[in-house]
Interface confidence: low
């Protein structure tokens, strides 16, 4: 849609004479039609396609027209159209007599035509006018045209429709060749799209107005950059939503199981080593003179068992004295009188010579030991298994027997539900007592996150007239492409064509 | 009508660099994000790098980010990737793609209109 | 070695459908669009299909693209002897702080 404008600017009829020779009575009262039409070769009456307007009388004779587009619109003149724009184009300018104040065709003699001039050419949509001036036998005619488009059309051809607006659809405003010029903060093909606050995280963060942050599930902070952790997460950090991977000396699934006992709370007494044995547990190694579990108690020198080969212990002054049973001497009945012809090892151990045969030493088969093979090895009395497991004797070797939700030889390792990765499309799993949970990306739900939730708005086929949809992704709308001669939000309207004057 | 117009073929020893030029016609350059895409020899493309042109915003390849910089010219609508260090196996065509969507801030948006190619080879 | 993984060849006759697949992960096909390109010999890549089954103005609708899950497939009816060429899926992918993926191209000969 656009205006082709026309701008008479002077007209000289020095003798005052008809297109005939004959002269006006008293002077020639000069008005004009304009008929602009379709490009034509030779340029022939017929229906002016694109248009016709008159002007009032406008002077007698020759004189100049003024630029009165302020008081009426009169010149130039407008010859509207709502259409696209070819780009060619014919002209016929009449300028005719008025001998009295009726200027219809009807009501004027035959032969009252001065002058009629037809142009015809190229026109590109502008804003600069061209000038032109056609001279005749007996007038000149001095007249300067353009196209210009109608206001919400752009383009070469006036045909493209944009229309400034800020709201829901869209927040733009029209550059001259009619495509969209985002409003500050927005963005996207139909600028709906907000810019979020600089540095918002592109998958973390969304916005739904500019300069705006909001997090997604499992993000936090102004830039939604940081994860939230595990609800109860106590002494852990997360990389992923959901996380709770402890930090150095603490476990178990919210990370409130101490691991390094001994540096949080240092519990061994007297100058005792410390070794951290699992969650909440610890072992205190005793310097010689102290025991009890954290090393808090003194113990007599006997206390230690010094004395071996079933050696009694006697507390003296200056330390300890071992009475020795038959076959043993020494400071600790270490040393045996006894040899391996004595056959000394019982349970069925080995016996081998040391020291030239003066001594021996046995070698005790599994489950059994002592310095003679005498004493049966309970394999259980460390309690070795961890985390309630119940430890089995089972021959030669023990066996833990694990409670749900725990496994390894020792029942040390935790059993993660999530270690299949059961959850789709990138859900963040998390272990529970008594299963597993996924959370879902956007766009996804269900138990596993395998249902999609996003829905394509053009699988309705809402565009007319074979426009094509384009699915916003952002706001799962659809938009419509129109084709030429189309219009409207789905392209339902057609674009009129022009009327056909009768010349 | 719309067109990416590249630079030349390129022949380069190891160690140096290589600037290749793409000029854009037929549209608004400054609405558009410019991509950058290799393709060695026999092989399938491989995505180096993205600038948008109308806010300025670069996006790289991980695997390329500390040898590979791609900048814009907007007062002659030219797009530029520079590649430093070259190894042998840098020799590919190098194609610069503009994004089918105006005006997004990240590239997640395919590329509708692709240059020639400026083929680079890395040789000593 | 391609993130999406295609066959690398498939052939067809003159009026036969072919199908080609592609199959990513949840960082990619399973979070975002998936685009397939069409390079005829010594030319530049061709946008066929655009997010998952959307076809550019001239690209015949004898192409059309579908997805599913982590996996998504561009087939092609009525097959014709110019459709002879490279076919490549791409996706964005998420991980590694974002990058565009492509498979290894499946050349499709008419035979």
């Known amino acids: 849609s656009g205006v082709f404008q026309l701008q008479l600017q002077e007209f000289i009829n020095e003798r005052g004479v008809l297109a005939s020779g004959r002269p006006c009575e008293p002077g020639c009262r000069t008005f004009f039609r304009v008929c602009l039409k379709h490009f034509q070769a030779v340029v022939s009456p017929g229906p002016c396609t694109f248009g016709t307007v008159s002007t009032p009388v406008l002077g007698t004779n020759s004189f100049a027209v003024r630029d009165d587009s302020s008081g009426g619109g009169r010149n130039p003149l407008q010859l509207p159209f709502n259409f696209t724009w070819p780009g060619t184009f014919s002209l016929i300018i009449e300028a005719w007599h008025a001998p009295g104040d009726d200027l219809r065709p009807e009501a004027l003699p035959p032969d009252a035509l001065i002058s009629k001039i037809a142009i015809q050419g190229s026109l590109a949509v502008g804003q600069n006018w061209l000038l032109d001036e056609q001279t005749s036998t007996l007038t000149r005619l001095r007249y300067s045209y353009r196209v210009i488009c109608s206001d919400n059309y752009y383009g070469d051809n006036c045909s493209r429709l944009c229309k400034k607006r800020n709201d829901h659809f869209g927040h733009y405003v029209c550059q001259p060749d009619g495509n969209l010029s985002c409003l500050p903060g927005w963005t996207g093909e139909y600028c709906q799209q907000p810019i979020c606050l600089s540095g918002c995280h592109e998958q973390n963060g969304y916005c739904s107005k500019p300069a705006e942050c909001l997090c997604r599930p499992g993000w936090q902070g102004r830039l939604c950059n940081e994860c939230i952790p595990h609800n109860g997460c106590r002494h852990g950090t997360c990389s992923t939503p959901w996380q709770c991977t402890c930090d150095e000396g603490w476990g178990g699934l919210f990370c409130d199981q101490d691991l390094n006992y001994c540096t949080h709370h240092s519990p061994c007494k007297n100058g005792a080593t410390c070794s951290n044995s699992g969650q909440r547990s610890y072992t205190c190694t005793c310097r010689p003179g102290y025991t009890g579990v954290d090393c808090e108690l003194e113990l007599s020198e006997c206390d230690s068992n010094p004395c071996r080969n079933g050696g009694s212990c006697k507390d003296q002054e200056d330390g300890y004295h071992c009475l020795c049973p038959p076959g043993y001497y020494g400071l600790h009945c270490e040393h045996s009188t006894l040899s391996c012809a004595d056959s000394p090892c019982f349970n069925g151990g080995s016996c081998r010579e040391r020291n030239q045969g003066a001594n021996y030493a046995c070698e005790c088969p599994p489950n059994f030991t002592g310095s003679n093979c005498e004493k049966k090895v309970d394999r259980c009395t460390s309690n070795p298994c961890a985390n309630g497991g119940q430890c089995l004797n089972r021959g030669p070797s023990r066996m833990c027997r694990c409670r749900p939700g725990f496994t390894g030889t020792y029942c040390e390792l935790h059993v993660s539900d999530c270690a299949r990765n059961p959850c789709a499309h990138g859900g963040t799993c998390h272990d529970l007592e008594n299963g597993l949970m996924c959370t879902c990306p956007a766009g996804f739900s269900g138990r596993r996150c395998e249902v999609r939730t996003s829905i394509d708005a053009c699988a309705s086929s809402p565009c007319f007239n074979r426009a094509t949809c384009y699915t916003d992704l952002s706001t799962d709308t659809f938009v419509c492409n129109c084709p030429y001669g189309f219009v409207g939000s789905r392209c339902e309207f057609p674009v009129g064509l022009p009327p056909s004057f009768p010349w | 009508q719309v067109q990416l117009v590249q630079s030349g073929a390129e022949v380069k020893k190891p160690g140096a660099s290589v600037k290749v030029s793409c000029k854009a016609s037929g549209y608004t350059f400054t609405n558009y994000g410019i991509t950058w895409v290799r393709q060695a020899p026999g092989q399938g493309p491989e995505w180096m790098g993205w600038?948008?042109?109308?806010?300025?915003?670069?996006n790289y390849a991980q695997k390329l980010q500390d040898r590979v910089t791609v900048t814009t010219d907007t007062s002659t609508s030219t797009a530029y990737m520079e590649l430093r260090s070259l190894r042998s196996d840098d020799t590919a065509v190098y194609y610069c793609?503009?994004?089918?969507?105006?005006?997004?801030?990240?590239?997640?948006?395919?590329?509708?209109?692709w240059g020639q190619g400026t083929m680079v080879t890395v040789s000593s | 070695q391609s993130v999406l993984t295609q066959p690398p060849s498939a052939s067809g006759t003159p009026g036969q459908r072919v199908t080609i697949s592609c199959s990513g992960s949840?960082?990619?096909?399973?979070?975002?669009?998936v685009y397939w390109y069409q390079q005829l010999p010594g030319t530049a890549p061709k946008l066929l299909i655009y997010?998952?089954?959307q076809r550019p103005s001239g690209v015949p609708d004898r192409f059309s693209g579908s997805e599913s899950g982590t996996s998504a497939s561009l087939a092609i009816s009525g097959l014709r002897s110019e459709d002879e060429a490279d076919y490549y899926c791409a996706a964005w992918d998420d991980s590694l702080s974002g990058h565009w993926v492509f498979g290894g191209g499946t050349r499709l000969t008419v035979l």
């Open positions: 997010r998952n089954n």
């Open positions: 949840s960082s990619n096909i399973g979070s975002y669009f």
């Open positions: 600038i948008s042109a109308y806010n300025g915003n670069t």
């Open positions: 793609a503009r994004d089918r969507v105006p005006r997004i801030p990240v590239t997640t948006e395919a590329f509708d209109i």
